[in-house]
């Protein structure tokens, strides 16, 4: 069964800066990755970045840099000020569309009482099947 993992980290140098890393643990071919915050995309969440393995990367504020780390994992750096700033309890979600498995999504947030610059190791988050 495919799994999606999500890791959220607050940067020690900039407290309004977050790094989100997501990965897909499956044998299928990834066709699209969507990163959202505030909940799953299409369920109250807002898209921050879209990453297509062949068509490139699109991102919107407060996303600063989205990138493919490997063929099955991505990272996104967020920074903001004022209304668009992420906060410590913000939920971030990554949705991987793959063939033939379909769409798999997982969400994560900053570990409770974590020190800036530290984060929990990337572990598979609760998996939501997107029909």
């Amino acid at each position: 069964t495919p799994e999606v993992w999500v890791q959220v980290r607050m940067e020690a140098t900039e407290l309004s800066s977050f790094t989100i890393r997501c990965g897909f643990l499956g044998s299928g071919s990834i066709s699209l990755v969507t990163v959202s915050w505030g909940g799953p995309n299409g369920a109250g969440g807002t898209t921050l970045a879209v990453l297509h393995p062949e068509r490139g990367i699109r991102q919107w504020a407060p996303a600063r840099q989205a990138r493919w780390e490997t063929q099955s994992s991505i990272s996104l750096i967020l920074e903001g000020s004022g209304a668009s700033s992420p906060c410590a309890n913000t939920t971030f979600c990554c949705k991987f569309a793959s063939f033939p498995e379909g769409s798999w999504e997982a969400c994560g947030s900053l570990p409770p009482s974590s020190d800036p610059g530290l984060s929990a190791p990337p572990t598979p988050a609760p998996i939501l099947r997107a029909d």
């Epitope: 807002t46 879209v50 393995p53 062949e54 068509r55």
Partner: antibody, heavy 114, light 113 residues
Framework: EVQLQQSGPELVKPGASVKISCKAS????????MNWVKQSHGKSLEWIGD????????NYNQKFKGRATLTVDKSSSTAYMELRSLTSEDSAVYYC???????WGTGTTVTVSS | DIVMTQSPSSLSVSAGEKVTMSCKSS????????????LAWYQQKPGQPPKLLIY???TRESGVPDRFTGSGSGTDFTLTISSVQAEDLAVYYC?????????FGGGTKLEIK
């Protein structure tokens, strides 16, 4: 069928503004970002910017930043581009294009003339 | 900004002939994570909006005839039409899909003799 229907041709005076619309149909409007592209007569294509329909967050080509404003109306599945302080150099066909430039609008001809 | 340079600016061929056109970028369009080249090709027929032909430098968009082939990597790319048809009369544009702002080449105008 996915379609992007744009507003009709515009004849505007130098210094004025123009607002072009792009109505999407055949898909969920908030699922795909929207691009705007300029094509001067007989010339190449210039990307103006894109907008995330989820929250109305835009990206702009630095060349158009400050003069172009991209907005969306989710209730009508319509994207808008406003261009201000027009000069003759802005006379062109303007296209909306959804997603990764997968589907293009019909185009809107803007003529700037006194 | 990444500058896209296409050549030739125009060419005239007879139906059935093979044609190749070039696109060069000022920076590499290869993504290190996916090992894919973020380059797209578009066809614009007279009086129509552009139409996506090829993305990822070599992947044909659904419905595009297999006589259209994209190739290349890094900064040098080629679009080949193996046997030109009358309906291929158009301007062909390449586009940087690698980094903002998305930029297009000046186009290659294909005329049929």
């Amino acid at each position: 069928e996915v379609q992007l229907q744009q507003s009709g041709p515009e004849l505007v005076k130098p210094g004025a503004s123009v607002k072009i619309s792009c109505k999407a149909s055949g898909y969920t409007f908030t699922d795909y970002f929207m691009n705007w592209v300029k094509q001067s007569h007989g010339k190449s294509l210039e990307w103006i910017g894109d907008i995330n329909p989820n929250n109305g967050s835009p990206n702009y080509n630095q060349k158009f930043k400050g003069r172009a404003t991209l907005t969306v109306d989710k209730s009508s599945s319509t994207a808008y581009m406003e261009l201000r302080s027009l000069t003759s150099e802005d006379s062109a066909v303007y296209y909306c294009a959804s997603g990764y430039f997968d589907v293009w609008g019909t185009g809107t001809t803007v003529t700037v003339s006194s | 900004d990444i500058v896209m340079t296409q050549s030739p600016s125009s060419l005239s061929v007879s139906a059935g002939e093979k044609v190749t056109m070039s696109c060069k970028s000022s920076q590499s369009l290869l993504n290190s994570g996916t090992q894919k080249n973020y380059l797209a090709w578009y066809q614009q027929k007279p009086g129509q909006p552009p139409k996506l032909l090829i993305y990822g430098a070599s992947t044909r968009e659904s419905g595009v005839p297999d006589r259209f082939t994209g190739s290349g990597s890094g900064t040098d790319f080629t679009l080949t039409i193996s046997s030109v048809q009358a309906e291929d009369l158009a301007v062909y544009y390449c586009q940087n899909d690698h980094s903002y702002p998305w930029t297009f080449g000046g186009g290659t105008k294909l005329e049929i003799k």
